[in-house]
Amino acid sequence: SAPGEDEECGRVRDFVAKLANNTHQHVFDDLRGSVSLSWVGDSTGVILVLTTFHVPLVIMTFGQSKLYRSEDYGKNFKDITDLINNTFIRTEFGMAIGPENSGKVVLTAEVSGGSRGGRIFRSSDFAKNFVQTDLPFHPLTQMMYSPQNSDYLLALSTENGLWVSKNFGGKWEEIHKAVCLAKWGSDNTIFFTTYANGSCKADLGALELWRTSDLGKSFKTIGVKIYSFGLGGRFLFASVMADKDTTRRIHVSTDQGDTWSMAQLPSVGQEQFYSILAANDDMVFMHVDEPGDTGFGTIFTSDDRGIVYSKSLDRHLYTTTGGETDFTNVTSLRGVYITSVLSEDNSIQTMITFDQGGRWTHLRKPENSECDATAKNKNECSLHIHASYSISQKLNVPMAPLSEPNAVGIVIAHGSVGDAISVMVPDVYISDDGGYSWTKMLEGPHYYTILDSGGIIVAIEHSSRPINVIKFSTDEGQCWQTYTFTRDPIYFTGLASEPGARSMNISIWGFTESFLTSQWVSYTIDFKDILERNCEEKDYTIWLAHSTDPEDYEDGCILGYKEQFLRLRKSSVCQNGRDYVVTKQPSICLCSLEDFLCDFGYYRPENDSKCVEQPELKGHDLEFCLYGREEHLTTNGYRKIPGDKCQGGVNPVREVKDLKKKCTSNFLSPEKQNSKSN
């Protein structure tokens, strides 16, 4: 029988009455148009909803928008459009919500053609009040908050000027012209690229990379011949044009661009690209596109300096620059990532790594599923996960994979079971152990979300017909109850719950359509009465993450340590609560070769944990470029994996000597840099 229909599935007592008392409908007095929703702050209950409606007139488009505010997680909304003087808000800029719990909101207004500058509405009290400010420029991008100080904003203008505000948008100053891209770094630093000749496009590959650490009082040129740059974790990356040809290479800095090293990665040509897939303070996953229009490339993982890279995964699916990749960080378990590869026959397969890119394998076939017609062998196949690429291809996939850091081990995704991703209608699968094992959770495509740190999973069937039923599970997707939240079905457009998965409220958004009109409507359901009591110690059980062989003393060791978690028992129907903190007990493991990546000049043959010298480098001195100086490496081929905490055990020798020689290949050496002050 289908999941959730087994005899052993106990029903949650009196849930219909409990949910009916906690279901709140709000009909918005709006023609349909579009709707966007933002949460303001964490655990504040404040939601802003912006509805916009475009009326195409003969010579122009007339726009109308309305702003609504809720302070009870969406149960009730108040029309606050008058706070923004009934101004039409530009949806392409979204609602710029300040970091952390600053309570700051910036809305960018539509202004008439001849105006000198744009207009913004600012709030610093969680959208209770707004201040109108006319800008001395027309914004090209949304206002960007400094992560360290929410009073500091930056924006690019349509004239390519870089504008900064130090008082939350009250006063603006243009600190530089001819700017292509600007990003906040750490400590209120701004990095940006500038062009000299004509435009960003024309100067691509001849841009300069600049830095200001004092909001535009002084500047330092930290790179030339720049194609693009990016920030990831503590790393600053720049792709730099080679002197001789049209190829470019990645350079990396860990000191805000003062010194640079050339990353030991392949160079790329004009039609290729680099992409930072994921980065933290320890390491980075870098995708390097293959030559030609192949749609795939190679994933490399870095060492702790972002300089030495190990090949992690071949034939990694990534369509074009800014295109689609299925690369997904499974945030519910350390070290786990899922992505897709393009096989030789042009089909797509899912791969998973449990050790931060060290090894990739196929996903284990779910116990309760049969292999589909993509499988060569009916008894041996894998689960293949639908992510961004499937969604871009308009396969019947309403949502990407979902995991939450505080719902330990839970991963939910659409998938098919076979030798490759199928074009047939997918089902929804769940893993409760971070991707090691999977179970079919729901038949057919669904929208899904996690509430109360995994205590409740909510799902709605993906259908072209109007819906009025929501499904929920209190046991990590084993058994499902259905609740009819309205008599009159609605055309469903989305599920909204507070980011962080700590809330017990879910909002179902959609629209009703009658003969003459259609209106936005939301239903907010509070599950607090389903989980009647707070969880106690007896409701939790000890779980060893990454456990594959309980007999082995090193079982659960990943990146040099193992972690035991306290996890909610599936049978416990109780509230983790908003203040729930994941309880984990780490313990250090002995080092083995698995805790080391292959050093510069070495590689791991397939299915071997030993690193061997690259044939083309055998007998050569291992020299590479570091901070613009030539370094000599004495190594037996191993370097500890970034973030690996193992101690004792295997300990390979490694020594780096400064050869006191300048690198000729480094385009970003310190003498090419200069400073200037305003």
Epitope: D293, G295, D372, A373, N377, G418, D419, I421, V423, M424
Partner: antibody, heavy 129, light 107 residues
Framework: QVQLVQSGAEVKKPGASVKVSCKAS????????MSWVRQAPGQGLEWMGI????????SYAQKFQGRVTMTRDTSASTVYMELSSLRSEDTAVYYC??????????????????????WGQGTTVTVSS | EIVMTQSPATLSVSPGERATLSCRAS??????LAWYQQKPGQAPRLLIY???TRATGIPARFSGSGSGTEFTLTISSLQSEDFAVYYC?????????FGGGTKVEIK
């Protein structure tokens, strides 16, 4: 030459099951998927599902899920389609058809569909009390 | 599932004339489309695959065009053996679905 030969006509009572066979010849049986399509009297064509002769894995249209079972015997180069819990509306001609492209989604280069290029002669199944 | 709609349901054409059959998909099927011909008492026969490529042995008077949601089968000069029912079929997303068919009859 390449051909698919199906079993003969069947008359069944409601609630019963029917098993139709389709024998392939003239090509390498395991290289091509096989679809089953049915056609009710005076109606259009309706796809029921597909089987991969290697491994025997299947994908069925939602409408037939739980009632249809497709199997194969590689040694006999034959695929079978069994439909259970028959009702009068299952009265139709059932065709097997070679389906070279299979059901795998394709990469950026796109998925080229080759169509159902070889069809069986059809098997008439009549469901009547 | 993707709904395929064929028009017209019946097309009356004189021999030697041109026939244009239309097929519309409820969402994009890219070029994953095939056309079939079926005569009374016979199994369908593949005419066009990949939206525009003629199958082996199909005369040049049959041509297919279109991609995405709008497709056309054109028979440039109808012969007596071309009077039949024509079906389009998508294989972009499962389940495969057929159009309702267009009957081409003698005027």
């Amino acid at each position: 030459q390449v051909q698919l030969v199906q079993s003969g006509a069947e008359v069944k009572k409601p609630g019963a099951s029917v098993k139709v066979s389709c024998k392939a010849s003239g090509y390498t049986f395991t290289k091509y998927y096989m679809s089953w399509v049915r056609q009710a009297p005076g109606q259009g064509l309706e796809w029921m599902g597909i089987i991969n002769p290697i491994g025997g894995s299947t994908s069925y249209a939602q409408k037939f899920q739980g009632r249809v079972t497709m199997t194969r015997d590689t040694s006999a180069s034959t695929v079978y389609m069994e439909l259970s819990s028959l009702r009068s509306e299952d009265t139709a001609v059932y065709y097997c058809a070679r389906d070279p492209s299979g059901i795998a989604a394709a990469g950026p280069a796109g998925r080229y569909y080759y169509g159902m290029d070889v069809w069986g002669q059809g098997t008439t199944v009549t469901v009547s009390s | 599932e993707i709904v395929m709609t064929q028009s017209p349901a019946t097309l009356s054409v004189s021999p030697g004339e041109r026939a244009t059959l239309s097929c519309r998909a409820s969402q994009s099927v890219s070029s994953n489309l095939a056309w079939y011909q079926q005569k009374p008492g016979q199994a369908p026969r593949l005419l066009i695959y990949g939206a525009s490529t003629r199958a082996t042995g199909i005369p040049a008077r049959f041509s297919g065009s279109g991609s995405g949601t709008e497709f056309t089968l054109t028979i440039s000069s109808l012969q007596s053996e071309d009077f039949a029912v024509y079906y389009c079929q998508q294989a972009r997303l499962g389940p495969w679905t057929f159009g309702g068919g267009t009957k081409v009859e003698i005027k």
